[in-house]
Interface confidence: low
């Protein structure tokens, strides 16, 4: 899909908060993913029909040093920056507009390179947009079961 | 308002080399891929480099590859293509071009001139 | 790579009239139900400028006489009602595969 290309990594810094948000916030901005997040993957779902999961990705979408667990912006910010180009143009900005609000300064983010083989990167994009939504559902309900 | 506003263009001796220079302003540079597109004196216009946003994957096409380099410092602003065993063929007005994500090229700047003559 | 053929490579029209210019890939440019095809117009003494991405989506501030169709090897771009600052070149390009490639362009008059 991408042809070749040459590779050197590092990462990048992206203006984000230096603390953490409130909770009243961070619960905004999921509001705010959830449509966005479930209408691109239903779009997706209804325009690559037969395609796979992927096995081979896995979003670390949730942090594991936290209680609730937190949306691992960081981790997520360079897989939709590495779909951009293949999904809606409007939706996912709106959604990396969203992420990076919730991302810390201090984070480090990696660029992702997507699956050169047509099929395998359709495949990457289904598995990257369904644990998406997966992790939005999760932090949204213990969000919900904890102090408003 | 998206401004791109490329310099370093000039005329130049076969197997010559010369960098160009843009200069981006009016929206967060870190974010965008960034291309530099061509346009021959016959005015076709042809592909020559991206850059990913950090800097990360950069895209040539096989006339191109290994001749000219694509570069970024995110923290001046600035895109670079550093051009080198140059040919006449390479004579054209050279782009520097905004991309979004990696496929759309959105925004173009007025183009610096490189003549490669002897 | 992939080819990309304009046709016609002239053509003048009427004002108020429409005005259609063909875009011809070599092999599909369409992925995952998307054509990676674009539009862009250039005027003399000017740089290009995005019309249509994707096939169909007019870019912001693009007037909506512009509309764009097509997907996998054949796409057209649609200009109607055609006005006098329409007088240009136009272009399609593909992102499908690298290395991007450009149609040859497409030069409009207007009568």
């Known amino acids: 899909m991408r042809g070749s290309h040459h590779h050197h990594h590092h990462g990048s810094s992206h203006m984000a908060p230096t603390h953490q948000l409130p909770p009243s916030d961070v619960r905004k901005i999921i509001l705010e993913l959830q449509p966005l997040s479930r209408g691109l993957l239903e779009d997706y779902q209804k325009k690559e029909t037969g395609v796979p999961e992927s096995n081979r990705t896995l979003l670390l979408c949730l942090t594991s040093d936290s209680q609730p667990p937190r949306l691992n912006s960081s981790a997520i910010l360079p897989y939709f920056r590495a779909i951009r180009p293949l999904s809606d143009k409007n939706i996912i900005d709106k959604i990396i507009e969203q992420l990076d609000k919730l991302k810390f300064q201090h984070e480090p983010e990696t660029e992702i390179s997507v699956p050169a083989d047509t099929f395998e990167c359709k495949s990457f994009i289904l598995t990257i947009l369904q644990q998406f939504s997966a992790c939005l559902e999760s932090v949204f309900k213990s969000l919900n079961s904890g102090p408003q | 308002e998206v401004q791109l506003v490329e310099s370093g263009g000039d005329l130049v001796k076969p197997g010559g080399s010369l960098k160009l220079s843009c200069a981006a302003s009016g929206f967060s540079f870190s974010n965008y891929g960034m291309s530099w597109v061509r346009q021959t004196p016959d005015k076709r216009l042809e592909w020559v480099a991206t850059?990913?946003?950090?800097?990360?994957?950069?895209y040539y096409p096989d006339n191109i590859k290994g001749r000219f380099t694509i570069s970024r410092d995110n923290a001046k602003n600035t895109l670079y293509l550093q051009m080198s065993s140059l040919k006449s063929e390479d004579t054209a007005m050279y782009y520097c071009v905004r991309g979004y994500g990696y496929d759309t090229m959105d925004y173009w700047g007025q183009g610096t001139s490189v003549t490669v003559s002897s | 790579d992939i080819l990309l053929t304009q046709s016609p490579a002239s053509l003048a029209v009427s004002l108020g009239q429409r005005a259609i210019i063909s875009c011809k890939a070599s092999?599909?440019?369409?992925?995952?139900?998307?054509?990676?095809m674009h539009w862009y117009q250039q005027k003399p003494g000017q740089q290009p400028k995005l019309l249509i991405y994707r096939a169909s989506n007019l870019e912001a501030g693009v007037p909506t006489r512009f509309s764009g169709s097509g997907s996998r090897t054949d796409f057209t771009l649609n200009i109607h009602p055609v006005e006098e600052e329409d007088a240009a070149t136009y272009f399609c390009?593909?992102?499908?595969?690298?290395?991007?490639?450009f149609g040859g362009g497409t030069k409009l008059e207007i009568k």
């Open positions: 390009q593909q992102s499908r595969e690298y290395p991007w490639t």
């Open positions: 092999q599909s440019v369409s992925f995952a139900g998307t054509g990676l």
């Open positions: 850059i990913s946003y950090g800097g990360s994957y950069t």
